[in-house]
């Protein structure tokens, strides 16, 4: 069983008399409706909270919102619907928040029938003040704030324009006409793809690729015969039609669309598709549907230019259309994914890799758990996490799993112990190692969130019923104090902390339904005072990540290096604090054949580290083509992983080859890559 | 079969210094903590503090802070401590010993080979 | 820095005897705790690591429990060779050592 509250846990002294004197409570003068939350900014404390509420009336619905502004991380909130001027605001588009620290926030309001355009309501002072705005078009979608200057916003219309705006939004532009999807890169680039024959859907896989690089001055058609594009990374990726028939496959770019490679990956059907699981400046993780209608595919992890690519994992979860994925990012711990795979009796196990998906294993059973009905042998299973894809099938998960970068090692997720996923209730299950091992944290589904580092954990039992009690633990789960935060029971709808988990304030949120009133409430609880003190040095230990085998003398070893952290001793009751930073210490490892994957024309046999050349590439539909001409390909038959650092060692040489491939799609043609201007 | 290895006795003059050396021989020296630990004669057992080979990663218990210094050196699998301003209290049999690890953990899982001990005398 | 108490401080035990030996932490320490043996004039033996897990080459008679800030050393049935002072040592925090137990003949 879980870790209780039993006497041996070690309370924190007086926790009650602490937590009472820092819980603000506050009500909501709405009828329910609902509500939505965004932060604005990093360490302002600033909260804007939107509720809107419907009416239905004989012929439309009449819409009302109102607006609260917290400058104190939720303690206490004050309505300022009345600078959006009363406007129902159109919670679609939510609340459009810039980036980092700049303050901006734009809100689309919701306008009668006959206007000649939408009106949004634009603030550059963390929402003190805002500016309306009348829009010389109807938005589709909410405004794009462009990553590199919050002030060049972009948004399409509902006639398929290009809108773009250089003052946050005071003026509009309308750039380009026919436009289906756009996208900032990075240099305040926009991509965005058009069509020609009437409609986005009828020009499907006919579609052009634009780029412009001064905010619509000038164009440059870098891509026809386009079904989608997509950036992850330091990538540009596109998926194209091929000549012959009605498959497509991908291409890739890594200097903006300038020049484009066919990624070494199988093309795909009609009713197939292609999804970017993952991407960073090394390397992406690339989903590659099966034919049919099976539910799952194949990952495929890339080299650093994108073009060659290793297969990953077999009967990858992922339901048709691109629905639904399990794939995650363990942000605590470099080189962690999760994900499930659809095994061939149709049952749902977790898989995770440890190493940026060279290697994937079933997660190691619990110590203090037993095997689920699901198994075949009671002494021997696996974890099993819920993700996305329980959550979408409405099993018993309020929460998919929990990760945070400054949290190291920590890993929040429900789950269940068997040979699969099962449909019973689950548990909360904890990882301190970046999913190595793990341990039951508690008994039965929750909300959880990460506070001050992971200096608290916040736990909340999910039910229908109304609660009134929240869990929080200072050992990284291990033992747990329950805090009455009120002694009226709310029905929960929500924990909310400020993003980053660096915060020691936990929103809870929730309404109170009384025979004729149903009001919002929030709670909010600040653990300052239960981390009394600041953390000192003695407060750390030393702690070696992907740590396995301490006699392997490359132990810790992952993509070339390994990282000891200090982390915060169980024990300890401290404050980690806003400004705490990770400390960490790298250590490059010797190279091993396990350093490197194939390239191009070699691949692995199975159980074998080598590369080995493909003695012809048949049954490979596979085409490889390098900025679209015959290129001269040289290689040893070993790259090195992206992203790995190591050094010495083993150093593969053999004779190098001279690779010729006949590149065959038009889509690179130059004839193509033709530049226009406004 | 991991050994840990120490130096011969010592006797020294209160005020000066001394530096023991513990020698790891037959596992991987680097990918354990070594911690320091004393027994004063018919007294229990106390802890100085420890260090990590690798980045050589040191933490020290309060009541030495300022006056010991562990230090590691990889090359030779050898971890020393160095104990200053020597009184007579410090007369003690000084233990290396080597942290057990089943995680990543250096420090958690209690201290499974430990050197033969180095007697160190302070007197005038 | 936490502080260990164990007791008893002595005890006089016979071979076959169960013997039981606590240790108390000022504070939480989960389950963070070894047990030593130690005979003069020897360095300490690890018997216990993470308050019950038995450290390989050490016979099953002795045991540990507990988890917070209570634990227990227990030896089943008490051998000749096991007349020694018992230390305990918490690995969470700086690491400190229980004041010890000496076992002896009854």
């Known amino acids: 069983s879980a870790p209780g509250e039993d006497e041996e846990c070690g309370r924190v002294r007086d926790f009650v008399a602490k937590l009472a004197n820092n819980t603000h409570q506050h009500v909501f003068d709405d009828l329910r409706g609902s509500v939505s939350l965004s932060w604005v900014g990093d360490s302002t404390g600033v909260i804007l909270v939107l509720t809107t509420f419907h009416v239905p009336l004989v012929i439309m619905t009449f819409g009302q919102s109102k607006l609260y502004r917290s400058e104190d991380y939720g303690k206490n909130f004050k309505d300022i619907t009345d600078l959006i001027n009363n406007t129902f605001i159109r919670t679609e588009f939510g609340m459009a928040i810039g980036p980092e620290n700049s303050g901006k926030v734009v809100l689309t309001a919701e306008v009668s029938g006959g206007s000649r355009g939408g009106r949004i309501f634009r603030s550059s002072d963390f929402a003190k003040n805002f500016v309306q705005t009348d829009l010389p078009f109807h938005p589709l979608t909410q405004m794009m704030y462009s990553p590199q200057n919050s002030d060049y916003l972009l948004a399409l219309s509902t006639e398929n324009g290009l809108w773009v705006s250089k003052n946050f939004g005071g003026k509009w532009e309308e750039i380009h006409k026919a436009v289906c999807l756009a996208k900032w890169g990075s240099d305040n680039t926009i991509f965005f793809t058009t069509y020609a024959n009437g409609s986005c859907k009828a020009d499907l896989g006919a579609l052009e690729l634009w780029r412009t690089s001064d905010l619509g001055k000038s164009f440059k058609t870098i891509g026809v015969k386009i079904y989608s594009f997509g950036l992850g990374g330091r990538f540009l990726f596109a998926s194209v039609m091929a000549d012959k028939d009605t498959t497509r496959r991908i291409h890739v770019s890594t200097d903006q669309g300038d020049t484009w490679s066919m990624a070494q990956l199988p093309s795909v059907g009609q009713e197939q598709f292609y999804s970017i699981l993952a991407a960073n400046d090394d390397m992406v993780f690339m989903h590659v549907d099966e034919p049919g209608d099976t539910g799952f595919g194949t990952i495929f992890t890339s080299d650093d230019r994108g073009i060659v690519y290793s297969k990953s994992l077999d009967r990858h979860l992922y339901t048709t259309t691109g629905g639904e994925t399990d794939f995650t990012n363990v942000t605590s711990l470099r080189g962690v994914y999760i994900t499930s795979v659809l095994s061939e009796d149709n049952s749902i196990q977790t898989m995770i890799t440890f190493d940026q998906g060279g290697r994937w294993t079933h997660l190691r059973k619990p110590e203090n758990s037993e095997c689920d009905a699901t198994a075949k042998n009671k002494n021997e299973c696996s974890l099993h996490i819920h993700a996305s894809y329980s959550i979408s099938q409405k099993l018993n998960v309020p929460m998919a799993p929990l990760s945070e970068p400054n949290a190291v090692g920590i890993v929040i997720a429900h789950g269940s112990v068997g040979d699969a996923i099962s449909v019973m209730v689950p548990d909360v299950y904890i990882s301190d190692d970046g999913g190595y091992s793990w341990t039951k944290m508690l008994e039965g589904p929750h909300y959880y969130t990460i506070l001050d580092s992971g200096g608290i954990i916040v736990a909340i039992e999910h039910s229908s019923r109304p609660i009134n009690v929240i869990k929080f633990s200072t050992d990284e789960g291990q033992c747990w104090q329950t805090y009455t935060f009120t002694r009226d029971p709310i029905y929960f709808t929500g924990l909310a902390s400020e993003p980053g988990a660096r915060s020691m304030n936990i929103s809870i949120w929730g309404f109170t339904e009384s025979f004729l009133t149903s009001q919002w409430v929030s709670y909010t609880i600040d653990f300052k005072d239960i981390l009394e003190r600041n953390c000192e040095e003695k407060d750390y230990t030393a702690w070696l990540a992907h740590s396995t085998d301490p006699e392997d003398y490359e132990d810790g070893c992952i993509l070339g290096y390994k990282e000891q952290f200090l982390r915060l001793r169980k024990s300890s009751v401290c404050q980690n604090g806003r400004d705490y930073v990770v400390t960490k210490q790298p250590s490059i490892c010797l190279c091993s054949l396990e350093d490197f994957l194939c390239d191009f024309g070699y691949y692995r046999p199975e159980n074998d580290s080598k590369c080995v050349e493909q003695p012809e590439l048949k049954g490979h539909d596979l085409e490889f083509c390098l900025y679209g001409r015959e290129e001269h390909l040289t290689t040893n038959g070993y790259r090195k992983i992206p992203g790995d650092k190591c050094q010495g060692g083993v150093n593969p040489v053999r004779e190098v080859k001279d690779l010729k491939k006949k590149c065959t799609s038009n889509f690179l043609s130059p004839e193509k890559q033709n530049s226009k201007s406004n | 079969q991991v050994q840990l290895v120490q130096s011969g006795a010592e006797v020294k003059k209160p005020g000066s210094s001394v530096k023991v050396s513990c020698k790891a021989s037959?596992?991987?020296?680097?990918?354990?903590?070594i911690s320091w630990v004393r027994q004063a004669p018919g007294q229990g057992l106390e802890w100085m503090g420890g260090i990590i080979p690798i980045g050589g990663w040191a933490n020290y218990a309060q009541k030495f802070q300022g006056r010991v210094t562990i230090t590691a050196d990889e090359s030779t699998s050898t971890a020393y401590m160095e104990l200053s301003s020597l009184r007579s209290e410090d007369t003690a049999v000084y233990y290396c010993a080597r942290q057990g690890r089943k995680t990543g953990y250096y420090y958690y899982y209690g201290m499974d080979v430990w050197g033969q001990g180095t007697t160190v005398t302070v007197s005038s | 820095d936490i502080q260990m108490t164990q007791s008893p401080s002595t005890l006089s035990a016979s071979v076959g005897d169960r013997v039981t030996i606590t240790c108390r932490a000022s504070?939480?320490?989960?389950?963070?705790l070894a047990w030593y043996q130690q005979k003069p004039g020897k360095a300490p033996k690890l018997l216990i690591y993470?308050?019950?897990s038995l450290e390989s080459g050490v016979p099953s008679r002795f045991s540990g429990s507990g988890s917070g800030t209570e634990f227990t050393l227990t030896i089943s049935s008490l051998q000749p060779d096991d007349f020694a002072t018992y230390y305990c040592q918490q690995a969470d925090g700086h690491i400190t050592f229980g004041g010890g137990t000496k076992v002896e003949i009854k």
């Open positions: 993470k308050a019950s």
């Open positions: 504070q939480s320490i989960s389950s963070w």
């Open positions: 037959g596992g991987t020296f680097r990918n354990y903590a």
